[in-house]
């Protein structure tokens, strides 16, 4: 750590005296801060010397010396007072800028430590401080106004009692700035806009800031618009509002509009798009396939997206058949608005029953006309199977009917013994019917197919099983020949 001679920590001299300050360290040393022209600075080996032959009150301040090579960053300081009977104050700055709630140091340094007891801070022309002002004083540094408020941003003077009279310093202007957390807050209304050519439109750009020093403008594409500004103050913030009013819009008014506001902290902008159309429009679409298949008993939500201008005058969901004349319950229909011109309409169909398969249509109307979007809903069913023994052209035939959706495929199994259902270990033979005969295939209904197994002689100690399956499930029916004829039964559920 460097050492200053004389040892200090304070040195009091009279104006006109010679002052020499020597700083000595292990390595090279240097004096901190700007050294005024009144001083001569020279190096002498490991020491640095500051000297002046004619000390003045303006030399009153703290002189600090550091040793750059010292890893601990040590320093030494001495405070020099040049006690001028006519000049009790040395003011280091005429303007001080702080943010609200910071401590503000007014750097008027006392030139004579003896005067400390009689110092006070006043406002310009001897006006008293606001009673809300709390300060402390340090003869080395000056007056500190604690947690400065904007309202305390005024001109101050430091006062010292000398021989019974108050002697003032030159004035110091304190500027207390509001803490600006960031660029102004912005709103641009509406977020998007559609108008038919010839209609009126209004776009409002507003910005707010905690102090009055901020700018705001509205820009169309790359052109800055000249719009009169309305100013206001509420919720402890300054507001600036720009309103663009268009009596009859045309295509040249369309495009991107940006609301831009800036303050000392930076710039903030937000944009919207204005679309001008020739006439009303109404578009319906769905992200879903319009042909839907759902397993019976399950639920389905049908969703339609609507883009429209002007707004909808009416809308509803309709069941178009073919099974019943029921209509969707209104409570199952739900509408949500994504934004001004886009809406989503949902029809919830919980626990679907066979009679609810068919066509569902969403209809909407605006001044542009009617539009409809129709969904076709087919229910999926697991196969139902039945087997009968019959004679066809004199031949004994097993006839298997399977009904379900999607269309079931059919497999015949022959297995040893009498059983309600063949398991893999018992299977003696498997026949797959690649093309069962389709008996019925109506829209929105089950598909019924028929498969024949011709058997001249059915072995008595065997079971014949018809199995049908599709994407939903499977069904089966077992046939057991008996001496007096035949017995058929479905497997136990």
């Amino acid at each position: 750590i460097p050492v200053i001679e004389p040892s200090g920590p304070e040195l009091v001299v009279k104006p006109g005296e010679t002052v020499t300050l020597r700083c000595v360290g292990n390595g090279s040393v240097e004096w901190d801060g700007p050294i005024s022209p009144h001083w001569t600075l020279y190096s002498d080996g490991p020491s640095s010397v500051l000297t002046t032959n004619n000390a003045t009150f303006q030399n009153t301040r703290t002189y600090r010396c550091t040793e750059p090579g010292d890893p601990l960053g040590g320093s030494a300081a001495i405070h020099l007072y040049v006690k001028d009977p006519a000049r009790p104050w040395n003011v280091l700055a005429k303007e001080v800028v702080v943010f609200e709630d910071q401590d503000a140091l007014l750097p008027c340094l006392l030139t004579d430590p003896v005067l400390e007891a009689g110092v006070s801070l006043v406002r310009l022309r001897g006006r008293p401080l606001l009673r809300h002002t709390n300060y402390s004083f340090s003869p080395w540094h000056g007056f500190i106004i604690h947690r400065a408020k904007f309202i305390q941003g005024q001109d101050y003077q430091c006062s010292a009692l000398m021989g019974g009279r108050k002697v003032m310093s030159i004035s110091i202007r304190l500027k207390v700035q509001k803490v600006i957390p960031g660029p102004p807050a912005l709103t641009l209304v509406p977020a998007e806009l559609v108008r038919i050519r010839g209609e009126a439109a209004q776009i409002v750009c507003s910005a707010s800031n905690i102090d009055v020093d901020f700018d705001v403008f509205l820009q169309h594409n790359t052109t800055k618009l000249a719009i009169p500004q309305r100013s206001d103050f509420h919720d402890n913030r300054y507001q600036k509002v720009l309103t663009l009013s268009l009596g009859q819009v045309d295509f040249q008014h369309a495009g991107n509009y940006s609301c831009v506001a800036s303050n000392v902290q930076g710039k903030h902008s937000t944009s919207m798009f204005f679309q001008v159309v020739e006439s009303a429009y109404l578009d319906l679409s769905s992200e879903q396939n319009l042909i839907q298949e759902v397993t019976v008993g399950e639920g389905l939500n049908l969703k339609v997206m609507v883009e429209a201008y002007p707004g909808l005058q009416g809308f509803n969901w309709t069941y178009l058949g073919p099974f019943s004349d029921h209509q969707p319950e209104p409570k199952l229909a739900n509408a949500t608005t994504k934004d001004t011109y886009r809406h989503t309409f949902t029809l919830s169909l919980p626990r679907l029953k066979p009679s609810e398969a068919g066509r569902y249509s969403f209809l909407a109307r605006n001044p542009g006309g009617w539009r409809a979007l129709t969904f076709e809903l087919t229910l999926r069913y697991p196969p139902e199977v039945s087997v009968i023994w019959t004679s066809i052209n004199g031949s004994g035939t097993l006839l298997c009917a399977a009904s379900g959706y999607p269309q079931p495929n059919v497999t015949w199994l022959q297995c040893a013994g009498h059983t309600d259902r063949c398991d893999e270990a018992q299977v003696l033979q498997v026949w797959v019917d690649p093309h069962p005969e389709v008996l019925s295939q109506e829209p929105f209904q089950k598909v019924t197919v028929q498969s024949l197994l011709t058997a001249e002689t059915l072995e008595h100690n065997q079971t014949y099983e018809c199995r049908a399956h599709n994407s939903v499930g499977s069904g089966s029916w077992a046939f057991i020949p008996i001496s007096a004829g035949a017995r058929t039964h479905p497997p136990d559920e």
Epitope: R127, P128, L129, R131, I151, Q154, N236
Partner: antibody, heavy 116, light 112 residues
Framework: EVQLQQSGPELVKPGTSVKISCQAS????????MNWVKQSHGKSLEWIGD????????TYNQKFRGKATLTVDKSSSTAYMELRSLTSEDSAVYYC?????????WGQGTTLTVSS | DVVMTQTPLSLPVSLGDQASISCRSS???????????LEWYLQKPGQSLKLLIY???NRFSGVPDRFSGSGSGTDFTLKISRVEAEDMGIYYC?????????FGAGTKLELK
């Protein structure tokens, strides 16, 4: 010229509220505290409180806490005092007054009469 | 609360007389920032208050030099060197150091 223009006299019923205004002109409203003072008939003066028009921060005389609420509207350079749950004890002349290290300018006063 | 005691409550004077009003505070009104917030006000009938003296002894702008203030700590005095007709009214002392700020009861200056 510094002027503090207060709202006109008020005759109100007990239990109600009243809001007195004080519009400042001739100086920058936000750089001076605004004080409010009550003068009851034939009595001395009571300090109600003050407000920093810049932040809305207020200091109240404990006696008037809950009775008076001080607010400002910077856009119109107006200070307000709302008095609630009024009784005959609140009948008085109320002054707004600018503070600059001392109270240097006073409004003309607003007479409040509370009577059923 | 700081109680400001004014004496006398009534002061009959003749024009040209010297008048003296005393104000005593129940505790020191020297602020922690070293200022003494002691003011004197005059209220004429039907009017609001006018500031005469601030900071114990400083005359407010436009106040005639016949008005002077003095004192320290807890004892303060307002003097009018040569009373004029326009000086009649009620004089209030006021302390602005401690919350709540408080006024004296007032001294009525009237012609004998």
């Amino acid at each position: 010229e510094v002027q503090l223009q207060q709202s006109g006299p008020e005759l109100v019923k007990p239990g109600t509220s009243v809001k007195i205004s004080c519009q400042a002109s001739g100086y920058t409203f936000t750089v001076y505290y605004m004080n409010w003072v009550k003068q009851s008939h034939g009595k001395s003066l009571e300090w109600i409180g003050d407000i920093d028009p810049n932040t809305g921060d207020s200091t109240y005389n404990q006696k008037f806490r809950g009775k008076a609420t001080l607010t400002v509207d910077k856009s119109s350079s107006t200070a307000y005092m709302e008095l609630r749950s009024l009784t005959s004890e609140d009948s008085a002349v109320y002054y707004c007054a600018r503070y600059d290290g001392y109270i240097d300018y006073w409004g003309q006063g607003t007479t409040l009469t509370v009577s059923s | 609360d700081v109680v400001m005691t004014q004496t006398p409550l009534s002061l009959p004077v003749s024009l040209g007389d010297q008048a003296s009003i005393s104000c005593r505070s129940s505790q020191s009104i020297v602020h922690s920032n070293r200022h003494t917030y002691l003011e004197w006000y005059l209220q004429k009938p039907g009017q609001s208050l006018k500031l005469l003296i601030y900071g114990v002894s400083n005359r407010f702008s436009g106040v005639p030099d016949r008005f002077s203030g003095s004192g320290s700590g807890t004892d303060f005095t307002l003097k009018i060197s040569r009373v004029e007709a326009e000086d009649m009214g009620i004089y209030y002392c006021f302390q602005g150091t401690h919350v709540p700020l408080t006024f004296g009861a007032g001294t009525k200056l009237e012609l004998k």
